[in-house]
């Protein structure tokens, strides 16, 4: 905590500028008006303040806004955002996507910190749902964002937002998450033709039920083995050898390399040997 001392004569800051770089902590505390700081927050990011100086500036804002900062200040926090605690952020009401983008930009290139997670949570809760623009923004900064949400949180994602999802955004999703996302994707892409539909739905198929896989097998989609290996075991087991052959197309030969891994292993054990032999791959049930 910086002591309360009078500002030395001639050192009262008329504006936030580089002349403050070399102010000591107590001088910043005594000589920088908090209201001035709040209105000129955008300038702070251009000035090489040290960690310690930023602590003082944050303290001044905390005193000015004990109930939480207004969005006009939050939007221009810049590097000062990295000084905020999750407790600070829980006091905020962030509604503008531009504010969210500005703060995510500050943390760019780093792991999602507790501060960022809290900010996103506040923002999404404030909006009521994870709309397309928000999802677009979040996955651009954090490709794994979607898979960090619980199935319950994912249920608030409207089907229209699914258009913002890229395949890499689903890389770390588990089956429970894909179970929630797949029906939304199916709805979102329902008006697309066969081949285009498959390209879009492919990353979500880890949540697809048996009947949808059967339907896909009738469309010459040539699913690759990587996608097949991510399918739900319980959805794959009822498929016939003929259906799997149609589903995989030329990729069916890859089953041999995966015969010891789920879901291929479990599926093989469910098939009649005669049917497996028709594939000519030497699969043993």
């Amino acid at each position: 905590e910086v002591e309360k001392t009078a500002c030395p004569s001639g050192k009262k800051a008329p504006e936030i500028d580089e002349s403050l770089i070399f102010y000591k902590k107590w001088e910043l505390e005594a000589c920088v008006d908090a209201a001035l700081l709040a209105t000129q927050m955008d300038r702070v990011n251009a000035i090489p303040f040290t960690y310690e100086q930023l602590d003082v500036l944050k303290h001044k804002l905390d005193e000015l806004y004990p109930q939480g900062y207004p969005e006009s200040v939050i939007q221009h926090l810049g590097y000062l955002f990295l000084k905020m605690s999750p407790e600070d952020i829980r006091k905020w009401n962030v509604t503008s996507l531009e504010t969210l983008k500005a703060l995510l930009e500050v943390n760019k290139g780093h792991e999602m910190s507790p501060q960022v997670a809290t900010l996103i949570d506040r923002f999404v809760k404030g909006r009521g749902q994870l709309d397309k623009d928000t999802l677009d923004t979040l996955t651009a900064f954090y490709p794994g964002y979607l898979c960090s949400l619980s199935p319950e949180e994912l249920s608030s994602v409207p089907p229209s937002s699914i258009w913002a999802v890229r395949p890499q955004d689903l890389d770390t999703c588990d089956p429970r998450q894909l179970d929630v996302l797949y029906p939304k994707a199916r709805l979102a892409f329902q008006n697309m033709n066969g081949s285009e539909y498959f390209v879009k739905i492919q990353s979500f198929l880890g949540g697809a039920p048996t009947e949808d896989l059967k339907a896909l097998s009738q469309q010459n989609v040539s699913m690759d083995l990587a996608t097949f290996m991510k399918l739900r075991t319980d959805a794959v087991l009822p498929l016939t050898v003929a259906e799997v052959q149609k589903l995989l197309g030329p990729h069916v030969e890859g089953l041999k390399a995966e015969e010891r891994h789920r879901p291929v292993r479990d599926w093989i054990l469910r098939q009649r040997q005669d049917d497996l032999d028709t594939l000519g791959l030497g699969l043993q049930g």
Epitope: P8, S9, G10, K11, E18, S19, I21, F22, Y23, K24, K25, E27, N45, A46, I47, P48, F49, T50, Y51, E52, Y79
Partner: antibody
Framework: EFQLQQSGPELVKPGASVKISCKTS????????MNWVKQSNGKSLEWIGV????????GYNQKFKGKATLTVDQSSSTAYMQLNSLTSEDSAVYYC????????????WGHGTSVTVSS | QIVLTQSPAIMSASPGEKVTMTCSAS?????MHWYQQKSGTSPKRWIY???KLASGVPARFSGSGSGTSYSLTISSMEAEDAATYYC?????????FGGGTKLEIK
């Protein structure tokens, strides 16, 4: 042991540019600002500018704006100063100097890099 | 910008003698820093925040002053103290240095 290891002497032609490096060790590079100071042939010292290695933010002496550009590479804990459009007036020894905690002067200095501008 | 004027520009002292050099600022500053530089080497922080001695600086050195007038004093001159001393302020932007006082041993 804190160290600020500067690049070697430079002999450059008028109008050219030069980039001086200052590799640091022994402390957390991003925790302290880095200053650059000019000393012309044994004369006094002139402050050029300062950079915050954590954010890349800079402050310059008006006299050196457009002449000097300060940058850092966090991965190698190195600060750089580029000097442009060199003239004989720029011939000097240039020092990097770490900013002390809470404005407590410049506590550690590099050994200096001599720049000579001559045709 | 604040101009710092050091005096004298050159001085010499005998071993054991008391030495005082001054630094006058064109406007009031809150703190003064002092650096020692020996020929062919980089400056070293010597006294900071007007009166605090940097690590390794002998106790015979002291600093004082306020406003526009500051000084560095050596209570008893030793041969190793021969060097140029620069004062520096960063109370006002941009930071500035004095022209230096060259201290020689008699």
């Amino acid at each position: 042991e804190f160290q600020l290891q500067q690049s070697g002497p430079e002999l450059v032609k008028p109008g050219a540019s030069v980039k001086i490096s200052c590799k640091t060790s022994g402390y957390s590079f991003t925790d302290y600002n880095m200053n650059w100071v000019k000393q012309s042939n044994g004369k006094s010292l002139e402050w050029i500018g300062v950079i915050n290695p954590n954010y890349g933010t800079t402050g310059y002496n008006q006299k050196f704006k457009g002449k000097a550009t300060l940058t850092v590479d966090q991965s190698s804990s190195t600060a750089y100063m580029q000097l442009n459009s060199l003239t004989s007036e720029d011939s000097a020894v240039y020092y990097c100097a770490r900013g002390g905690y809470d404005g407590e002067a410049m506590d550690y200095w590099g050994h200096g890099t001599s720049v000579t501008v001559s045709s | 910008q604040i101009v710092l004027t050091q005096s004298p520009a050159i001085m010499s002292a005998s071993p054991g003698e008391k030495v005082t050099m001054t630094c006058s600022a064109s406007s009031s500053v809150n703190y003064m820093h002092w650096y020692q530089q020996k020929s062919g080497t980089s400056p070293k922080r010597w006294i900071y925040d007007t009166s605090k001695l940097a690590s390794g600086v002998p106790a015979r050195f002291s600093g004082s002053g306020s406003g526009t007038s500051y000084s560095l004093t050596i209570s008893s001159m030793e041969a190793e103290d021969a060097a140029t001393y620069y004062c520096q302020q960063w109370s006002s932007y941009p930071p500035t240095f004095g022209g230096g006082t060259k201290l020689e041993i008699k």
